[in-house]
């Protein structure tokens, strides 16, 4: 149903039935003995989407997910029994839920699962070349998964595998109390965050991990973790959640006398995503749900997109906030949070900060220390007691780029595509929800790049039954979006241009960067094809200018088009 209305009303709202009828969705409805299709790994080179699920790992063809291979990786009956004996649910907990699926090298993936509350990891052979058609479990090589996968399938792991080392934020114990950021695998001793210290991590829920270079020197590379956690006592009145960004240096090998095999460069800062509310009290979106990094020409400065929801049960809302890495770095170079005063409240640390500044990576760029093991004792002592920054990271423009508060759903996932249109580049967001719908939203700059207008292009129901979308990937090569849920997978093209209507005006008014009027129909826009007959106006959506004569066929038709 085509609707040309306010920005918060989708131009196109498509039910699951309409998506099927227009060949706009391909679904994989899961296997009878599996579920939880939550762990995605996109391989554009091989044209595969690897998916970790309950007791299975899948390799889907990106062209059509109906074409797939599968590995069955259940737990032994003995592990299942032990899990059951521990009072866990045989279906929902006493199975192997795959939580980590990463490229290990050119020929293998690394996978970890909950192993029925007994985390386990192994390698998956995928061959040298796509045509090898190899997809098999290395069942002679199992490894302990503690500190890599959680025990409990309800928990997530944020992980990153680089240079043969696995960085993971997860729960490292049966009870789900010992949360930590680990580095395992590789040749070095495993490293983790300080244990039983709520200043470091306070019952966190990890979202994702990313390597972001700090300079042209790879020694300065940092790994950033995104998570949400309980606010530390005194930081907030009452129990509250805070969204966080944490950093660690890739070349952190722990301390020498103190913080041995613990991170010495761990710092965290709060991510703010809020709107001014009545009575001068801001409405905060604190429950970070997902993060997407949009790479720019400068690899040091990707744009961070975050999806947030409210903590309140009374007021349900979702928001998308954008952050710049320069703002993040500014906060990490700012004052540390310190407890002081009669009420032992958090204040900016005013004293002498030891040299080299805690959080700085040991390298030639920022000082003469070759290793964190060489750091002076006062640096280590300070780092141990000051893991948090005082200043929060505010979003670009100090406000969300999109908010939804008057709807019966919440945002869960986000992926973003940078699209070349006739009148410039646009970021198109695909936002997954907890009811199985995907929103397609375009950010349109107004006067300045920082001032954005959000246009909700489409709202698509991609699963038959309402089900939370728990994973999303976008293939720029295939021009397809993939969504995972407890029940299965959905694949959809990034555009449905024909659905906007059969007139130039409707196509133009849609303001979809993927679509343009080609003289006969609203069809996919290819930037390379510089045909004079392509009508498109994303910035203004003005059909009068673009659809009048000038070689453009098609009648001016302002009537809404219904299917």
């Amino acid at each position: 149903n085509y609707q040309n209305g306010k920005n918060n009303v989708p131009r196109l709202k498509l039910s699951y039935k309409e998506m099927l009828e227009s060949n706009s969705v391909i679904t994989f409805n899961g296997l009878a003995n599996s579920s939880s299709y939550h762990t995605f790994l996109l391989d554009e080179e091989r044209s595969r989407l690897y998916v970790g699920a309950k007791d299975h790992i899948f390799s889907f063809n990106l062209v059509n997910i109906k074409d797939f291979q599968k590995i069955v990786w259940p737990v032994s009956y003995t592990r299942r029994d032990e899990c059951k004996w521990a009072g866990k649910d045989i279906q929902k907990e006493c199975a192997n839920f795959i939580k980590v699926l990463k490229a290990y090298n050119q020929t293998h993936l690394y996978a970890c699962g909950t192993g029925a509350f007994h985390p386990i990891c192994t390698y998956i052979e995928i061959g040298h070349h796509p045509e090898d058609n190899i997809f098999k479990l290395e069942d002679s090589h199992f490894e302990n998964g503690r500190g890599k996968s959680p025990y409990d399938p309800k928990l997530l792991t944020a992980s990153l595998l680089i240079d043969g080392e696995l960085y993971s934020g997860t729960a490292a114990d049966f009870m789900g109390r010992d949360f930590a950021i680990f580095r395992t695998l590789g040749h070095h001793h495993p490293i983790r965050t300080e244990q039983h210290d709520s200043r470091w991590l306070n019952d966190p829920r990890f979202i994702s991990a990313h390597l972001i270079p700090e300079s042209d020197n790879p020694e300065d590379d940092k790994v950033y973790f995104f998570f949400r956690e309980n606010a530390i006592d005194g930081e907030h009145t009452g129990k509250a959640t805070h969204a966080r960004i944490g950093q660690i240096c890739k070349n952190d090998f722990g301390g020498h006398r103190s913080l041995v095999n613990k991170w010495t460069t761990f710092l965290k800062a709060r991510l703010i995503c809020s709107v001014p509310g009545p009575n001068g009290i801001d409405t905060h979106f604190d429950e970070l749900q997902d993060v997407f990094l949009m790479n720019s020409k400068d690899p040091k400065n990707p744009i961070v997109y975050g999806v947030f929801t409210t903590s309140s049960n009374i007021f349900k809302g979702s928001a998308v906030c954008m952050y710049s890495m320069s703002d993040v770095r500014r906060v990490f170079l700012g004052p540390y949070a310190h407890r002081d005063g009669p009420n032992y409240q958090w204040v900016p640390y005013q004293g002498r900060v030891p040299y080299p500044r805690p959080g700085t990576c040991p390298s030639k760029t920022f000082g003469g220390f070759d290793s964190t093991k060489d750091l002076p004792d006062d640096v280590i002592t300070f780092a141990r007691s000051h893991p948090a920054m005082y200043n929060p990271v505010f979003p670009i423009n100090n406000r969300p780029i999109m908010i939804k508060t008057d709807v019966n759903y919440q945002f869960t996932q986000i992926v973003v595509d940078r699209v070349d249109a006739e009148d410039g580049q646009y970021d198109v967001m695909f936002i997954g929800t907890d009811v199985g719908t995907v929103l397609k939203v375009v950010s349109i700059p107004k006067e300045t790049w920082h001032d954005l207008e959000e246009v909700l292009l489409e709202e698509m129901t991609v699963f038959r039954e309402p089900t939370p979308i728990s994973a999303m990937e976008l293939s720029t090569k295939q021009h397809q979006l993939y969504a995972g849920s407890p029940a299965g997978l959905a694949q959809l093209p990034l555009q449905r241009c024909a659905a906007y209507g059969r007139a130039c005006a409707e196509c133009c008014l849609a303001r979809d960067p993927y679509c343009a009027w080609d003289g006969a129909a609203c069809s996919r826009y290819f930037p390379a094809a510089k045909a004079r007959t392509r009508a498109q106006d994303i910035r203004n959506g003005d059909p009068l200018t673009h659809c009048s004569d000038g070689g453009i066929e098609g009648r001016m038709d302002h009537h809404h088009h219904h299917h």
């Epitope: 032994s76 009956y77 003995t78 592990r79 299942r80 029994d81 032990e82 059951k84 004996w85 521990a86 009072g87 509350f117 007994h118 302990n144 503690r146 025990y151 114990d173 049966f174 009870m175």
Partner: antibody, heavy 116, light 111 residues
Framework: EVQLLESGGGLVQTGGSLRLSCAAS????????MSWVRQAPGKGLEWVSW????????YYADSVKGRFTISRDNSKNTLYLQMNSLRAEDTAVYYC?????????WGQGTLVTVSS | QSVLTQPPSASGTPGQRVTISCSGS????????VSWYQQLPGTAPKLLIY???HRPSGVPDRFSGSKSGTSASLAISGLRSEDEADYYC???????????FGGGTKLTVLG
């Protein structure tokens, strides 16, 4: 070859305490749940307690709950049973058993005699 | 009083087939795997059957296990004198959150 060797048994007065140990070898101790099972003289087997491979979960039979504590030290490949407030009915041979969905390996047992 | 019920004794002559029963409820045998243990005189118990009917390596195929509903049974065919021992069935009990054993069956090989 899997081996389980119990020690620490002996004669103790009612109300007294005893700590049993079980040294394990021949398998990756830290990968398996472990258990204690006892057998009173001339009687059948009675499960006492079990502990998860990483100590994350512990279970006890009602007859010993609150008095016995199971623990393990994975770095020493050793299982323990701390027995407090012992009663005459706790007199038995105490076996340490490797748990693998069932008790697939047993030690030879250590005798605990509680006298009044 | 054991949660699982076994006959206190059973007997047979060499070469004969003997069956030992084990009766329980839905919270143990009905919904959980049954194991059988053999205890030779003066020794520790040994696992004989696991997961209702599976034999660990080294256990002769003369021993077999089966389960139906809330009852299980152990069959020994081609009885031999060295089979003389106490036999226990066992299973996890979901409602008790503990492992339960039968009272044991003393098998005597006659003649």
């Amino acid at each position: 070859e899997v081996q389980l060797l119990e020690s620490g048994g002996g004669l103790v007065q009612t109300g007294g305490s005893l700590r049993l140990s079980c040294a394990a070898s021949g398998f990756t101790f830290s990968d398996y749940a472990m258990s204690w099972v006892r057998q009173a003289p001339g009687k059948g087997l009675e499960w006492v307690s079990w502990i998860y491979y990483d100590s994350g979960s512990k279970y006890y039979a009602d007859s010993v709950k609150g008095r016995f504590t199971i623990s393990r030290d994975n770095s020493k490949n050793t299982l323990y049973l701390q027995m407090n407030s012992l009663r005459a009915e706790d007199t038995a041979v105490y076996y340490c058993a490797k748990l693998n969905g069932d008790f697939d390996y047993w030690g030879q047992g250590t005798l605990v005699t509680v006298s009044s | 009083q054991s949660v699982l019920t076994q006959p206190p004794s059973a007997s047979g002559t060499p070469g004969q087939r003997v069956t030992i029963s084990c009766s329980g409820s839905s919270s143990n045998i009905g919904n959980n795997d049954v194991s059988w243990y053999q205890q030779l005189p003066g020794t520790a118990p040994k696992l004989l059957i696991y997961a209702d009917s599976h034999r660990p390596s080294g256990v002769p195929d003369r021993f077999s296990g089966s389960k139906s509903g809330t009852s299980a049974s152990l069959a020994i065919s081609g009885l031999r004198s060295e089979d003389e021992a106490d036999y226990y069935c066992g299973a996890w009990d979901s409602s008790l959150s503990g492992y339960v054993f039968g009272g044991g069956t003393k098998l005597t090989v006659l003649g």
